[in-house]
Interface confidence: low
């Protein structure tokens, strides 16, 4: 049988041994910053080049001399997971190893920085194809390490890191907290978050996705043919580095933003049992388990979007929270959420030449989150149209008036501490889909975009009786760009997108009456790009296909029983 | 890595006269900030990453590092420049007493200083 983890990352319709071609990832170079490695291990021999880079602290303790080739253990296993002949994800990827962790698996921020600088200099001296950097390490939050990762990412390098094994918020650790890095948590064969002793995988808004990270069979440094099972978010990150190498090998021109969106898009959704996470982290933690794409063709036409949560604003009255998209992404909508329900909405505003999503706390509130919907929309021209609070009692409205602009999201923001629930909800008059409607005391912000072939439609799901959660989803072929609530009254805790579903949360049913005051409508804006679909069809017609699909029928990899050596 | 403190001490003394005339006040603008790991056992006091403002050139980084050494020497402190960064971030890695942080934060071009800390295999 094939190891569970390789089976898990294979799309359902394919057999893992047929799917993972022997030369997958061959156009990509993966840098591994870790311990020393046993480069003559049969799994990775000839695939991993050990660079002369070494920057490690001295080992602690007096009994160190008795640990010998434990020095190679962590790095060898991870190199095997990324590119191992039998148990690797991207069997064709070539790797370069830098030693930044000592024999006890310990390194320094400064050593890691110098390692990242070494990679950047190597890239400048000898530019190669796509680069993936795997950082299977974590320390406390570090501004400088995050900054270095940001610079390297902006130089076109894909960085993948472990979320950390501390059963804690990944945002408290680096490089896991760096927004430009792809941060990976660990799940097990049951798609549950991995428990490691008394701790386990990190979680929270800084995690991009999860991947297999428990009982992972890979190269053991004990001998050149040994295999061992290891667990941790490092193993999970190694899977994603391998998947990234496969994707980049099939589409070398992918940007970091495109790669991240594809990783999210092709992940298995909603399979993780969220009960394992602390209650306040569940909504922030992505319920995604990484998988290889079924094929690279057919992905190009899709409008890809992801949800980005801000840090918590904190409880002060005027506190705000800001969520930002990556440089190559468009902010198509902005929403907010507060567990206490005390918030003053959200608005899209320009900051440094880019739109950001800002949420506002209210007096007595415990704080808010801003939630940005970040999408890949080439040649988009987006702007925000604002209507101040209405004089009349009909409510505030704003629409996209420019020719060719479509509505992608609605936000509302109010200065009053409590909008009150005494007014009946204002529903959008039919036949005016390009319009945002809100409470008369709120200012309304419409995100209006023009992009070739972009079309959007509004979907609403109203519930007359109070309910803690109202959802509305976009149908197949459409992507959720906007998610908001009508009427935005004080019992609404907020709205946010989960994959292609708009979720509106309200205060506990028991605290709201069952009158019309409890009525809530979830409003989803669903978009698609005819232009992207067309371009993709043209591409498929004009190429003989260099994607993963065309190498599916490549040589089958047998998984021999003796590889279960430590299993 | 062998300790080169002997050689380095001579270098510091040689730098003293060269740098004595330099002004110690930072450039106008925001004050540089100091950061350290929130997890106490992971801190590595005594080694600091001095990060300079974004457009600082390598020569300015080296000059700033030398200036720090000279000013520290004037106060009787030994410092050791372990690495000068360029390519990703401008700055340098310095081994020095924490007593010198206030001085280092006032150096020209300094954006922020971070105390070194541990990272671990996951």
């Amino acid at each position: 049988s094939i190891p569970w983890n390789l089976e898990r990352i294979t799309p359902p319709r394919y057999r893992a041994d047929e799917y993972q071609p022997p030369d997958g990832g061959s156009l990509v170079e993966v840098y591994l910053l870790d311990t020393s490695i046993q480069s003559d291990h049969r799994e990775i021999e000839g695939r991993v080049m050990v660079t002369d880079f070494e920057n490690v602290p001295e080992e602690d303790g007096t009994r160190f001399h008795r640990q010998a080739s434990k020095c190679d253990s962590h790095g060898t296993h991870l190199a095997g997971v990324v590119s191992g002949r039998d148990a690797g994800v991207a069997k064709g990827a070539s790797m370069r190893s830098l030693r930044v962790l000592n024999c006890q698996g310990k390194g320094t921020v400064s050593g890691t920085l110098i390692g990242l600088e070494f990679i950047r200099k190597s890239q400048l001296v000898q530019p190669v194809g796509p680069l993936v950097v795997l950082l299977p390490l974590a320390g406390g939050y570090s501004r400088v390490l995050n900054a270095a990762c940001q610079r390297l990412a902006r130089a076109g390098v894909v960085l993948v890191t472990a979320a950390g094994n501390f059963r804690d918020d990944a945002c408290l650790y680096s490089p896991a907290s760096a927004p430009e890095v792809i941060t990976v948590g660990a799940t097990n064969a049951q798609d549950q978050p991995v428990t490691l002793g008394t701790l386990g995988t990190n979680f929270g808004r800084c995690v991009d996705l999860f991947a297999p990270g428990e009982d992972i069979i890979g190269a053991s440094s004990d001998c050149s043919t040994c295999f061992v099972s290891q667990s941790g978010t490092s193993q999970a990150a190694a899977h994603v580095a391998g998947i990234a190498a496969m994707m980049l090998s099939a589409e070398p021109e992918l940007t970091l933003a495109e790669l991240r969106q594809r990783l999210i898009h092709f992940s298995a959704k909603d399979v993780i049992n969220e009960a394992w996470f602390p209650e306040d982290q569940r909504v922030l933690t992505p319920n995604l388990v990484a998988a290889l794409p079924p094929s690279t063709h057919g992905a190009g036409w899709q409008l890809f979007c992801r949800t980005v949560w801000s840090a918590h604003s904190g409880p002060t009255r005027m506190a705000t929270a800001v969520a930002r998209c990556a440089p190559d992404e468009e902010l198509l909508s902005c929403s907010s959420f507060s567990r206490s329900g005390k918030r003053r909405g959200e608005r899209m505003e320009a900051q440094g030449g880019k739109l950001v999503c800002r949420a506002h706390n209210a007096f007595g509130g415990e704080g808010v989150y801003a939630i940005a919907r970040c999408c890949l929309l080439p040649q988009a021209n987006c702007s925000v149209h604002t209507a101040p609070p209405a004089e009349a009692s009909m409510g505030t409205r704003v629409h996209c008036h420019q020719q060719g602009h479509v509505l992608t999201g609605c936000s509302s923001h109010w200065e009053v501490e409590d909008l009150g629930t005494h007014k009946p909800p204002v529903l959008r008059p039919r036949g005016q889909p390009n319009q945002c409607v809100g409470h008369r005391e709120a200012s309304i912000h419409a995100s209006c975009c023009h992009a070739p072939g972009l079309e959007c439609k509004v979907k609403e799901h109203g519930i007359p009786a109070p309910q803690e959660q109202v959802t509305v989803a976009c149908e197949e072929g459409w992507t959720l760009t906007g998610c908001s609530a009508l009427p935005g009254t004080s019992h609404v805790l907020g709205a946010y997108a989960v994959d292609n579903t708009c979720v509106v949360r309200s205060r506990d049913v028991s605290t709201t009456g069952s009158t019309s005051e409890g009525a809530v409508t979830a409003v989803a804006i669903c978009c698609r790009s005819r232009h992207l679909a067309q371009a993709s069809q043209e591409l498929q017609g004009s190429t003989s296909g260099s994607g993963l699909n065309d190498i599916f029928e490549a040589q089958k990899i047998e998984w021999h029983e003796h590889h279960h050596h430590h299993h | 890595q062998e300790d080169e403190d002997g050689d380095y001490e001579e270098l510091v003394l040689a730098l003293r006269s060269e740098e004595d005339g330099l002004a110690e006040a930072p450039e106008h603008g925001t004050t540089a900030t100091f950061h350290r790991c929130a997890k106490d056992p992971w801190r590595l006091p005594g080694t600091y990453v001095v990060v300079l403002k974004e457009e600082t050139h390598l020569s300015q980084s080296e000059r700033t590092a030398r200036r720090l050494q000279a000013q520290a020497a004037r106060r009787g402190y030994l410092t050791k420049i372990l690495h000068v960064f360029h390519g990703l971030l401008p700055g340098f890695l310095v081994k020095m007493s924490g007593d010198l942080l206030e001085l280092a934060l006032k150096l020209p071009h300094v954006d922020y200083i971070e105390e070194d800390s541990s990272v671990f295999a996951q």
């Epitope: 020393s36 046993q38 480069s39 003559d40 008795r66 640990q67 010998a68 080739s69 434990k70 020095c71 190679d72 253990s73 490691l196 002793g197 009982d215 053991s220 440094s221 004990d222 001998c223 050149s224 043919t225 040994c226 061992v228 099972s229 290891q230 667990s231 050596h565 | -």
Partner: antibody, heavy 121, light 112 residues
Framework: QVQLVQSGAEVKKPGASVKVSCKAS????????MHWVRQAPGQGLEWMGY????????KYHQNFKDRVTMTRDTSISTAYMELSRLRSDDTAVYYC??????????????WGQGTTVTVSS | DIQMTQSPSSLSASVGDRVTITCKSS????????????LAWYQQKPGKAPKLLIY???TRESGVPDRFSGSGSGTDFTLTISSLQPEDFATYYC????????FGQGTKLEIK
């Protein structure tokens, strides 16, 4: 001081199961792998498998993998080895032995005193 | 599986003698990166648990008298007791840990 104390001798009938315990003291239980080695009367030493107390991960020798189960209870720093479907040739002294450092297959620096298991009808 | 062959299976010697026990493995036990041989020697007295003497083919465990020494590399290894003491009469086992674990069949050292 560091020691491994095993449970007492057992007499079992063929087909039955036996569960031997090994209580560790004087060190951090989860920092060392625990191995089980047996020795039939007048014979040499035979390695059976190990458990990593920190993760619960086990590896069994091919000859035993269908019949042996190794477990641990970290709260009481105890490792267990259960052998099922006992045969008369399972009569042996069973030792637990600690292996320094979690994933290094080097050597066993501390051993239990041994538990005699007799299988007889 | 790696096979370990010890010789002789038994030997008689007197106090003060120099004794050599050899151990051959069916494949090399040398890890090419660490340059360590994954071979250990144990001493076992009747009714007692084995005791570690030597690891990595030649490194003495702390507390082991220096009359015990280990040598060899690759597939051929030797345990030498330079001057036998009364407490040294026991059975000695070699063990490989290069690929899982295998013990040699043992060498019984008896008083002549």
């Amino acid at each position: 001081q560091v020691q491994l104390v095993q449970s007492g001798a057992e007499v079992k009938k063929p087909g039955a199961s036996v569960k031997v315990s090994c209580k560790a003291s004087g060190y951090t239980f989860t920092d060392y792998w625990m191995h089980w080695v047996r020795q039939a009367p007048g014979q040499g030493l035979e390695w059976m498998g190990y458990i990593n107390p920190s993760s619960g991960f086990t590896k069994y020798h091919q000859n035993f993998k269908d019949r042996v189960t190794m477990t641990r209870d970290t709260s009481i720093s105890t490792a267990y080895m259960e052998l099922s479907r006992l045969r008369s040739d399972d009569t042996a002294v069973y030792y637990c032995a600690r292996q320094y450092d979690y994933d290094e297959d080097w050597y066993f620096d501390v051993w239990g005193q041994g538990t005699t298991v007799t299988v007889s009808s | 599986d790696i096979q370990m062959t010890q010789s002789p299976s038994s030997l008689s010697a007197s106090v003060g003698d120099r004794v050599t026990i050899t151990c051959k493995s069916s494949q090399s036990l040398l890890n090419s990166r660490t340059r360590k041989n994954f071979l250990a020697w144990y001493q076992q007295k009747p009714g007692k648990a084995p005791k570690l003497l030597i690891y990595w083919a030649s490194t003495r465990e702390s507390g082991v008298p220096d009359r015990f020494s280990g040598s060899g590399s690759g597939t051929d290894f030797t345990l030498t007791i330079s001057s036998l003491q009364p407490e040294d009469f026991a059975t000695y086992y070699c063990k490989q840990s290069f690929n899982l674990f295998t013990f040699g069949q043992g060498t019984k050292l008896e008083i002549k």
